[in-house]
């Protein structure tokens, strides 16, 4: 029990997408403030978010400092102006976070088609490679440095004039794809993390067609 | 435990329609890609059609364009097989299986079929 | 679409053979191959993905490889479960296509 007016938070949700991450909660303060901690399993407790009104924390410059590892984190309720009361028990009350594990659980975020050229009847598809905060030797990593092989696109892609959608997948950030000559096509990428058994996919990028800016056509 | 689970088989009139369900357990449909395919009696596997239900993408073989439609009630998760101007050669087990979206996407996991006669 | 042309139709084997499935892509599918085994009135079973992994579960004495455009399926040491039909399957470009099957019976 804490103390008086001072409710524990509850409702304790991560939001991450691409490593970006945020550790969201309940209720909206009324007279308290919250205090966030963060920790790996073996870590010490890192406070973030001192004395905060708000109901979310940026927990994302803790957790890419190593995304394979599994954190916890906790948020404190303290009465608003008397933050150095405790609870009963002498300590702040405080409510855990589910475990969360970056690597098998941030969400894959939208992706976008960079550019794609026509050869002849073949078109070289190419995605986007997202930059994440995921950093190393003080240079911000992209989604596919960070995921590897572990990371694959698949492309939907089908004729202007037709709705069957063809696929092709790859586990570079380009697609070599055989097309009809004279036809134009549209494409849609998805990102997939084959090995995870949740959070698996993206949302479909923006559906880019031939004829249109973002393409290159060259008769051979 | 991931099961996928076909029902609505049974016999039919030439010209005449069914709907397949394909019902899956033990895994979200929208994390994957579901594809029908078929047996005919005493043949081999044939490819009927795909459908990503997280976007409702679809494609589908030749033998059943226009006539087959693959959607999906994420809701449910459940996938379907509406089948209409149904030919004696639709006779077939029909299997709906997952595909786990990798390089080489098998198909790991399988129905246990439902049998559709195409018949007079 | 691409064919895959799957031989022999059917064999003969004992238990405790060596068998050998071999399939044949009409184009580059690189390794975008699976192998099923399917016994009457089942479902297929995966076995090997990717041209050359075992899937899990599966028993070690099934293997597959790769040489170009032809794809192999081994099994080293026939048990008597393995008497089954067993298919190749491709899944580089849509639509995925299925070889023939192979059936292996009991001599």
């Known amino acids: 029990s804490g103390t008086t007016n001072t409710v524990a938070a509850y409702n304790l949700t991560w939001k991450s997408t691409n490593f970006k991450t945020i550790l969201e909660w309940e209720p909206k303060p009324v007279n308290q403030v919250y205090t966030v901690q963060i920790s790996t399993k073996s870590g010490d407790w890192k406070s973030k978010c001192f004395y905060t009104t708000d109901t979310e924390c940026d927990l994302t410059d803790e957790i890419v400092k190593d995304v394979k590892q599994t954190y916890l984190a906790r948020v404190f309720s303290y009465p608003a102006g008397n933050v150095e009361s405790t609870g009963s028990a002498g300590e702040p009350l405080y409510e855990n976070s589910p475990e969360f594990t970056p690597y098998l659980e941030t969400n894959l975020g939208q992706p976008t088609i960079q550019s794609f050229e026509q050869v002849g009847t073949k078109v070289n598809v190419t995605v986007e490679d997202e930059r994440t905060l995921v950093r190393r030797n003080n240079t911000f990593l992209s989604l596919r440095d960070v995921f590897g092989k572990d990371l694959i696109y698949t492309l939907y892609y089908w004729k202007s004039s037709s709705s069957g959608k063809k696929t092709a997948k790859t586990n570079t950030n380009e697609f070599l794809i055989d097309v009809d000559k004279g036809e134009n096509y549209c494409f849609s990428v998805q990102a997939v993390i084959p090995s995870r058994t949740v959070n698996r996919k993206s949302t479909d990028s923006p559906v880019e067609c031939m004829g249109q800016e973002k393409g290159e056509f060259r008769e051979i | 435990e991931v099961q996928l689970v076909e029902s609505g088989g049974g016999l039919v009139q030439p010209g005449g329609s069914l709907r397949l369900s394909c019902a899956a357990s033990?895994?979200?449909?929208?994390?994957?890609?579901i594809h029908w395919v078929r047996q005919a009696p005493g043949k081999g596997l044939e490819w009927v059609g795909y459908i990503d239900p997280s976007n409702g993408y679809t494609y589908y073989a030749d033998s059943v364009k226009g006539r087959f439609t693959i959607s999906a009630d994420t809701s449910k998760n459940t996938a379907y097989l509406q089948m209409n101007s149904l030919r004696a050669e639709d006779t077939a087990v029909y299997y709906c299986?997952?595909?786990?979206?990798?390089?080489?996407?098998?198909?790991?996991?399988w129905g246990q079929g439902t049998l559709v006669t195409v018949s007079s | 679409d691409i064919q895959m042309t799957q031989s022999p139709s059917s064999l003969s084997a004992s238990v405790g053979d060596r068998v050998t499935i071999t399939c044949r892509a009409s184009q580059d599918v690189n390794t975008a191959v699976a192998w099923y085994q399917q016994k009457p009135g089942k479902a297929p079973k995966l076995l090997i993905y990717s041209a050359s992994f075992l899937y899990s579960g599966v028993p070690s004495r099934f293997s597959g490889s790769r040489s170009g455009t032809d794809f192999t399926l081994t099994i080293s040491s026939l048990q008597p479960e393995d008497f089954a039909t067993y298919y190749c399957?491709?899944?580089?470009?849509?639509?995925?296509?299925f070889g023939q099957g192979t059936k292996v019976e009991i001599k």
């Open positions: 299986a997952r595909d786990d979206q990798s390089l080489s996407s098998p198909f790991d996991y």
């Open positions: 399957q491709q899944h580089y470009t849509t639509p995925p296509t």
């Open positions: 033990g895994f979200t449909i929208s994390d994957y890609i």
